[in-house]
Interface confidence: medium
């Protein structure tokens, strides 16, 4: 997260760290007791590594009573996700067992009504991604409030040049932005999950390259079919 600040500890009980061989790889969001939603591209280079999900964490390294690492039973990427595109960049991870819920571990309601979030709406994005252009990785969860950007502006030739479909949404990126390592994490508007950070290699913090988020409401049928 660029231009953000340290989050209040355990105030986002839905927040997950998707880990590869014991190290943070991507963000994720607990959407059901045994399911975490993340981004499909996150695991493209996971190769033969051990994928796990950390729940109930604020610090990645310090012991915390609510922290627990879960093995992954099943990784279900969206069937239309492709290595070359940002479209359909969603992944559902089934935990090896139902998460132990409590004040620091709780699923987040996700948007089912397929309607765009109003431009200018302030939404919260959180993650353990890099905090500066030098690539410094934080130990504790960071967050930032970002205004939603209208699709027409986001699709300008100087911005994302038509790449933003109706299944994607944008947020402003003027110095405050999600970045590498935040992919798969939640964009939360009014206490509801609206978007998932896409995992492209986009430049961060440049206002002409807004943050791109996959709209979960657009994938409600797929999410429901996997969770069923």
């Amino acid at each position: 997260i660029l231009g953000g600040r340290e989050a209040e500890a355990h105030a986002r009980p839905y927040m997950a760290s998707v880990q590869l061989n014991g190290a943070h790889l991507c963000g994720g969001v607990l959407v059901a007791e045994q399911w975490v939603l993340s981004a499909a591209h996150c695991l493209e280079d996971a190769a033969d590594g051990k994928v796990q999900v950390l729940l109930g964490a604020h610090s990645l390294s310090q012991p915390e009573p609510s922290k627990r690492l879960y093995d992954v039973l099943r990784a279900v990427p969206h069937p239309d996700s492709q290595p070359d595109t940002i479209d359909h960049d969603l992944l559902l991870l089934q935990l090896s067992e139902k998460a132990t819920l409590g004040p620091a571990v709780r699923p987040l309601p996700w948007q089912r009504v397929d309607r765009d979030v109003a431009p200018g709406t302030l939404c919260d994005v959180a993650g353990w991604g890099i905090v500066n252009h030098a690539g410094r990785r934080p130990d504790s969860l960071q967050h930032v409030l970002l205004p939603v950007l209208d699709r027409a502006t986001c699709n300008r030739r100087t911005h994302h040049d038509g790449a933003i479909t109706e299944r994607l949404m944008c947020a402003e990126s003027n110095r405050r932005d999600s970045c590498k390592g935040d992919s798969g994490g939640p964009l939360v508007c009014g206490g509801v999950l609206e978007g998932v950070v896409t995992s492209g290699s986009r430049v961060c913090g440049n206002r002409k390259k807004p943050g791109i988020y996959t709209r979960v409401a657009s994938y409600a049928a797929w999410i429901d079919s996997v969770l069923a």
Partner: antibody
Framework: EVQLVESGGGLVQPKGSLKLSCAAS????????MNWVRQAPGKGLEWVAR??????????YYADSVKDRFTISRDDSESMVYLQMNNLKTEDTAMYYC???????????WGTGTTVTVSS | DVLMTQTPLSLPVSLGDQASISCRSS???????????LEWYLQKPGQSPKLLIY???NRFSGVPDRFSGSGSGTDFTLKISRMEAEDLGVYYC?????????FGGGTKLEIK
């Protein structure tokens, strides 16, 4: 550049042994599972063996046709994968490819192959 | 072992035409993780094979959109919408859901 280079092929007599090597470069070798796939002259592809990464305890898997005769192994420090072939038969004559194994997909990077000929 | 049967063995196609290759598995190839690891590879003359399609219908990096995969259960199809000269070679289907992993026998795409 991601690259796999096989070596060690050659002519060997039936019941003989041969060890193939594969040098990997351009990627984090220790996190990938690796495979050997072969192709007999004028024939189709046949998967031979797979070895997983350290995080999966270097688990190995084999085609029935080579089980108990071939052994796949790896050296992560040198980014090498090997195929020790014992008790070779004429039907083992083939081009042997070293192949990288992805997460969502299987064989995403192939070497150029090394030829093994088993003949008396 | 899962037997992968490809048809036809040989397929003469005119440039610009559509080509369709079928692959049938002897049993379901849905993996225990819920994914179907059915892939298609192209081997051009004198070259190593290259991955085209993974998980039934997903194009790999750099693969043109004239290639598409479909199917479920035990029946799968690879389609090339507009045949180009560079598409010539032998196409193989492959299942990675059950050990031992198995390839189809191959389909040779030729110019009519």
């Amino acid at each position: 550049e991601v690259q796999l280079v096989e070596s060690g092929g050659g002519l060997v007599q039936p019941k003989g042994s041969l060890k193939l090597s594969c040098a990997a470069s351009g990627f984090s070798f220790n996190t990938y599972a690796m495979n050997w796939v072969r192709q007999a002259p004028g024939k189709g592809l046949e998967w031979v063996a797979r070895i997983r990464s350290k995080s999966n305890n270097y688990a190995t898997y084999y085609a029935d046709s080579v089980k108990d005769r071939f052994t796949i192994s790896r050296d992560d420090s040198e980014s090498m994968v090997y195929l020790q072939m014992n008790n070779l038969k004429t039907e083992d004559t083939a081009m042997y490819y070293c192949v990288r194994h992805g997460y969502y997909w299987y064989f995403d990077v192939w070497g150029t192959g090394t030829t093994v000929t088993v003949s008396s | 072992d899962v037997l992968m049967t490809q048809t036809p063995l040989s397929l003469p196609v005119s440039l610009g035409d559509q080509a369709s290759i079928s692959c049938r598995s002897s049993q379901s190839i849905v993996h225990s993780d819920g994914n179907t690891y059915l892939e298609w590879y192209l081997q051009k003359p004198g070259q190593s094979p290259k991955l085209l399609i993974y998980r039934v219908s997903n194009r790999f990096s750099g693969v043109p959109d004239r290639f598409s995969g479909s199917g479920s259960g035990t029946d799968f199809t690879l389609k090339i919408s507009r045949m180009e000269a560079e598409d010539l070679g032998v196409y193989y289907c492959f299942q990675g859901s059950h050990v031992p992993y198995t390839f189809g026998g191959g389909t040779k795409l030729e110019i009519k």
